[in-house]
Interface confidence: medium
Amino acid sequence: PEPPTACREKQYLINSQCCSLCQPGQKLVSDCTEFTETECLPCGESEFLDTWNRETHCHQHKYCDPNLGLRVQQKGTSETDTICTCEEGWHCTSEACESCVLHRSCSPGFGVKQIATGVSDTICEPCPVGFFSNVSSAFEKCHPWTSCETKDLVVQQAGTNKTDVVCGPQDRLRA
C-alpha cells in the first residue's frame, strides 16, 4: 500500500508511517515502528503537557514567586500548568500574572478613569482627541490640550494623546 501523506487526528506522520500522539500528561519516549506502538511516559512531579503531543520533554510548572507577591491559585497537574494569583489586595500586572502591583499605573496616552480601591484596581481610559497624558500614573486623569487661542497664540505643533500642543506667536505678516 501507498505510504500515507496525512494522518488521522491524534496521530503524526514519521518515516512514512502514522504514529499515535502521546496523550496530555505524557511525553514521547520513542516513535512507533511497523511493529511497535508509540512509547510514552508520564510527566514527572512539577511537570506538565496540556495537549496531545510528540514532545520529548514536559514543561515545568510555573513558579509563583512570593517575592513578587504571587501565590498559587490552582496547583498544576500532569496536564495543566500552575495558575498564579496575587496576594490579597494586590493586582496582576498582566493576564499571565507574572508579578503584582498594589494598584496599576496608567501608561502615557492613558488617564485614570477610576482610582484603585482596596478591592478594585485602577481603571485606565485612552485619552480622547483634545486630551493627553505624558506620565505613567495611578492617579492622573487625561489633561486637556492647552488652548493657544485664549493666549492669543497659534498652534505650532499639534498635540497627541501623549503630548500637549505647542503654542507659538501669531504670524505678524498677516493682515
Epitope: 513578587l68 508579578s99 503584582c100 502591583v101 499605573s105
Partner: nanobody, 116 residues
C-alpha cells in the same frame, strides 16, 4: 540599582506628630510618582499617600486625609510624610515605594508605634 531608605519612625503618643523621610537613589527621582504604603501588625498592605513627579499633585487615603501631608524635594531625591494627630490605628511599618510596581522597588520600612 533602585534603592529606597526610610527613616524617622519611632514611638509617639496619640495626638503626636512624626515626619518620615525616604532617601531615593538609582533612578531619575523627579520622573516618578512616589508613594507611602503601610503594613499594620498582622494586616495586609494599605496605600497611604502619593505625590506626582513634580510635587504639585498629592493624593491621600481617606483614613489619613487632613492629618498626613506628603511632599518631596527633588533636588535632594527625598520623599517626606508629615504625620499629625496620630492615632493607635496608624501603628505600622511605613514604606516608601516607586510607582507601586514591583516588590523589589521597596525600602525596608520604618516602624511607627502610636501608644500611650
Amino acid at each position: 540599582e533602585v534603592q529606597l531608605l526610610e527613616s524617622g519612625g519611632g514611638l509617639v503618643q496619640p495626638g503626636g506628630s512624626l515626619r518620615l523621610s525616604c532617601a531615593a537613589s538609582g533612578f531619575t527621582f523627579e520622573w516618578y510618582e512616589m508613594q507611602w504604603v503601610r503594613r499594620a501588625p498582622g494586616k495586609g498592605l494599605e496605600w497611604v499617600s502619593a505625590i506626582s513627579g513634580d510635587g504639585y499633585r498629592t493624593y491621600y487615603a481617606d483614613s489619613v486625609k487632613g492629618r498626613f501631608t506628603i511632599s518631596r524635594d527633588n533636588s535632594k531625591n527625598t520623599l517626606y510624610l508629615q504625620m499629625n494627630s496620630l492615632r493607635a490605628e496608624d501603628t505600622a511599618v511605613y514604606y516608601c515605594a516607586k510607582e507601586l510596581e514591583y516588590f523589589d522597588y521597596w525600602g525596608r520600612g520604618t516602624l511607627v508605634t502610636v501608644s500611650s
